[in-house]
Amino acid sequence: AVNGTSQFTCFYNSRANISCVWSQDGALQDTSCQVHAWPDRRRWNQTCELLPVSQASWACNLILGAPDSQKLTTVDIVTLRVLCREGVRWRVMAIQDFKPFENLRLMAPISLQVVHVETHRCNISWEISQASHYFERHLEFEARTLSPGHTWEEAPLLTLKQKQEWICLETLTPDTQYEFQVRVKPLQGEFTTWSPWSQPLAFRTKPAALGKDT
């Protein structure tokens, strides 16, 4: 079915991966489709097979090279095509001239760890993964802390408007279990979006010292 609403969205992780999602209402789940990437100034082409992620959407990752290799630059344009098999031939279903550094979504931050914890505060650090050296320090972060009895959606967002890979959480409750997440976004790119949230880091504040007013 071609008449259903369809959408094709891709993001570049700034190094060697373009992740794409193709959605089409009314398409058959077993339809065989792929994404083809054709850069304007590179010798390589790349293809990935779209695999179902929900009733009407498919996703795949164009792996352009080693994870930390810089495969594209700000001047590259990559023509992307969705191709679906119809009988013996492939049919083009979507096309886009993709500017990688206008469509960025970095990998989630990794290696979260508690640097220091007290009764009311906790210092946490993390690292960014597979982020281009082109950004230098032009990154921002959002963080959130899950308190007991609340959901992630209710957690207030803490914004770090610079490349700062640590945070000191304050006004915490003693002897309490918390979880913490962080995500990253380059300042560059008209259609750039936030990375996925990091894996949550669980930590517990220290108990208040007995007989002391802390």
Epitope: V2, S6, Q7, F8, L80, D97
Partner: nanobody, 125 residues
Framework: EVQLVESGGGLVQAGGSLRLSCAAS????????MGWFRQAPGKEREFVAA????????MYAESVEGRFTISRENAKNMVYLQMNSLKPEDTAIYYC??????????????????WGQGTQVAVSS
């Protein structure tokens, strides 16, 4: 915001040719994927062809592949549809459409945010 005006339609005999033009105004035209759709009397609007903003990528409806060619001239803010070997079943109102900037060109109407008023093409047998 992109404004689109089609021209070049008319009456032609089967086997003949026409070239449709779409004039676009708006600063974002040169980085916008464009498409042509058509609507025959009593039928739904259907996809005809699309082109990426550099012109490197094109796609066509099965019914027009090999007969129609989509092209663009960004310096003039123009998109064209060269229609050869026309058939009576190509009779329709032809619409130019623009996707929102940064969005892919697809085969469904919902992928396009800006539309022209249309130009009539009639193919007689």
């Amino acid at each position: 915001e992109v404004q689109l005006v089609e021209s070049g339609g008319g009456l032609v005999q089967a086997g003949g040719s026409l070239r449709l033009s779409c004039a676009a105004s708006g600063r974002t035209f040169s980085t916008t994927e464009m498409g042509w759709f058509r609507q025959a009397p009593g039928k739904e609007r259907e996809f005809v062809a699309a082109i990426t903003w550099t012109g490197r990528g094109t796609m066509y409806a099965e019914s027009v592949e090999g007969r129609f060619t989509i092209s663009r001239e960004n310096a003039k803010n123009m998109v064209y549809l060269q229609m050869n070997s026309l058939k009576p079943e190509d009779t329709a109102i032809y619409y130019c459409a623009a996707a929102r900037r940064g969005r892919a060109a697809v085969r469904s109407e919902g992928g396009y945010d800006f539309w022209g008023q249309g130009t009539q093409v009639a193919v007689s047998s």
